[in-house]
Interface confidence: medium
C-alpha cells in the first residue's frame, strides 16, 4: 500500500500540540472534520469532531482537544494541550461526507512526547500570561462512528497512545493545562 | 464580500473619553471576532484587543488595560471601542478588524480620533 | 508579550525586483503569522495567513514562509501597486503584536 507522508512533531510533556489542516474553501467548508488516531492495525480511531453543519471558527473541546474551524480561510486548527507521553503516536484530520467515506488531510501527525519539559519558552508551551480558558460551555460534537477502513494504509509503529476520554474535562488547576488563545476568528 | 463600516471622525479633549462604532454588512458578528487596531501618526500598527462574540469575554493589550473596554454581542451589533482618559497620543486612526488565529481578512474603513485641548 | 521584529525598517526597490523581509518572533509561534500590505488612507489588506497560506485574490507573487521563529514575506516580482508599507503580525497568543513595518519604496 501507499506511504502517506508524515510529518514529525517532537514535544514535551506538558506542551502543546498545535497544527493546522488544510482543506479546499467552498466544498468543504461546513462538513464535519475530526481528529483520529491511527493505532497499530486498527481502523482510524475518532478523537474529536466538529460540529455538524461545522460552525465557523466555534472551538470544540473534548478532553485535552480543542478543534477550530476557519471557513474563511479553509483551515481546521488542532490543539492537544498538556500533552502526556502516552499521547505519542500517529495522528490524522479527516472530514467526514456520508455517504462517501471519510477524505484524510495530509499530512499525518506522527507525535512523540519525551519526559520532562523544556526550559525555554516555545510555541508549544503555556504560559501563565494572556491566556484565553475556554468555558465550561465550549461545544462538544457528537462524531459519527464510522470511520474508512481504506485510511488504513500501513501500519504505525505500536503506540500506547490513550487520549483523554470525551468526557473529560480540562483541569485548569495546574499553569500547563491552560488553554491558550486565539479561540477566536 | 464582507464591509465592516465603522462611525465618523472624532474630535475629543484631553481627559475625556470616546466611543466607535463597528457595523458589519449584513447583520451581526455572529461567530466571528472583533479586534480593534489603532495607527498614530508615523507610527506602526498597534493590537488594543479584541472580542470573540459566543464567549463574550475581551482581551486587552496590557497597554491599554484598565482604559479600553471592546464589546460586541452575538445576536446584536454593531460592536464597540470605548477609550477613556484619553491623552494626545491616543491620536490615531482606529480600525476594527475581523479575524484571529488566521489573521485579518476584513477590515473597517478606520476612525480618526483627534484628541486635542 | 511576544515581540516580532521586522527588518529591514525601509528598501529601496525597482519595478521587477524579488523584494524579501523577513520578521523575527520573540518566541516560537508555530505557524500563527500573517503578513499585510498597508498604504496611507487605507485599510491594513491580508496577503499571508497562517506563515504560508495565500489569502483568496492576493497575486501569487506574494509568498510567506516560516515556522517558529523566522518568518520570510517574499515579493517575487515587485509591481507598480506593490509600493506600500507591510506588516506581520503574530496570531499566536495574546496580545496579538505586529511587528514595526516595512516600507518599500520606489528605487
Known amino acids: 500500500a501507499t506511504k502517506l507522508t508524515e510529518e514529525k512533531y517532537e514535544l514535551k510533556e506538558g506542551q502543546t500540540l498545535d497544527v493546522k489542516c488544510d482543506y479546499t474553501l467552498e466544498k468543504f467548508a461546513s462538513s464535519q472534520k475530526a481528529w483520529q488516531i491511527i493505532r497499530d492495525g486498527e481502523m482510524p480511531k475518532t478523537l474529536a469532531c466538529t460540529e455538524r453543519p461545522s460552525k465557523n471558527s466555534h472551538p470544540v473541546q473534548v478532553g485535552r482537544i480543542i478543534l477550530e474551524d476557519y471557513h474563511d480561510h479553509g483551515l481546521l486548527r488542532v490543539r492537544m494541550v498538556n500533552l502526556q507521553v502516552e499521547d505519542s503516536g500517529l495522528y490524522q484530520c479527516v472530514i467526514y461526507q456520508p455517504p462517501k467515506e471519510p477524505h484524510m488531510l495530509f499530512d499525518r501527525i506522527r507525535l512523540v512526547v519525551t519526559k520532562g519539559f523544556s526550559g525555554t519558552p516555545g510555541s508549544n508551551e503555556n504560559s501563565t500570561q494572556n491566556v484565553y480558558k475556554i468555558p465550561p460551555t465550549t461545544t462538544k460534537a457528537l462524531c459519527p462512528l464510522y470511520t474508512s477502513p481504506r485510511t488504513v494504509t500501513q501500519a504505525p509503529p505500536k503506540s500506547t497512545a490513550d487520549v483523554s476520554t470525551p468526557d473529560s474535562e480540562i483541569n485548569l488547576t495546574n499553569v500547563t493545562d491552560i488553554i491558550r488563545v486565539p479561540v477566536f476568528n | 464580500q464582507v464591509q465592516l463600516v465603522q462611525s465618523g471622525a472624532e474630535v475629543k479633549k484631553p481627559g475625556s473619553s470616546v466611543k466607535v462604532s463597528c457595523n458589519p454588512s449584513?447583520?451581526?458578528?455572529?461567530?466571528?471576532?472583533i479586534s480593534w487596531v489603532r495607527q498614530a501618526p508615523g507610527q506602526g500598527l498597534e493590537w488594543m484587543g479584541g472580542i470573540n462574540p459566543i464567549f463574550g469575554t475581551a482581551n486587552y493589550a496590557q497597554k491599554f488595560q484598565g482604559r479600553v473596554t471592546i464589546t460586541a454581542d452575538e445576536s446584536t451589533s454593531p460592536g464597540y471601542l470605548e477609550l477613556s482618559s484619553l491623552r494626545s497620543e491616543d491620536t490615531a486612526v482606529y480600525y476594527c478588524?475581523?479575524?484571529?488565529?488566521?489573521?485579518?481578512?476584513?477590515w473597517g474603513q478606520g476612525t480618526l480620533v483627534t484628541v486635542s485641548s | 508579550d511576544i515581540q516580532m521584529t521586522q527588518s529591514p525598517s525601509s528598501v529601496s526597490a525597482s519595478v521587477g525586483d524579488r523584494v524579501t523581509i523577513t520578521c523575527r518572533a520573540s518566541q516560537g509561534i508555530s505557524s500563527w503569522l500573517a503578513w499585510y500590505q498597508h498604504k496611507p488612507g487605507k485599510a491594513p489588506k491580508l496577503l499571508i495567513y497562517a506563515a504560508s497560506s495565500l489569502q483568496s485574490g492576493v497575486p501569487s507573487r506574494f509568498s510567506g514562509s516560516g515556522s517558529g521563529t523566522d518568518f520570510t514575506l517574499t515579493i517575487s516580482s515587485l509591481q507598480p501597486e506593490d509600493f506600500a508599507t507591510y506588516y506581520c503580525?503574530?496570531?499566536?497568543?495574546?496580545?496579538?503584536?505586529f511587528g514595526g513595518g516595512t516600507k518599500v519604496e520606489i528605487k
Open positions: 449584513g447583520g451581526t458578528f455572529s461567530t466571528y471576532a
Open positions: 503580525q503574530q496570531a499566536n497568543s495574546f496580545p496579538f503584536t
Open positions: 478588524a475581523r479575524g484571529g488565529a488566521v489573521g485579518f481578512a476584513y
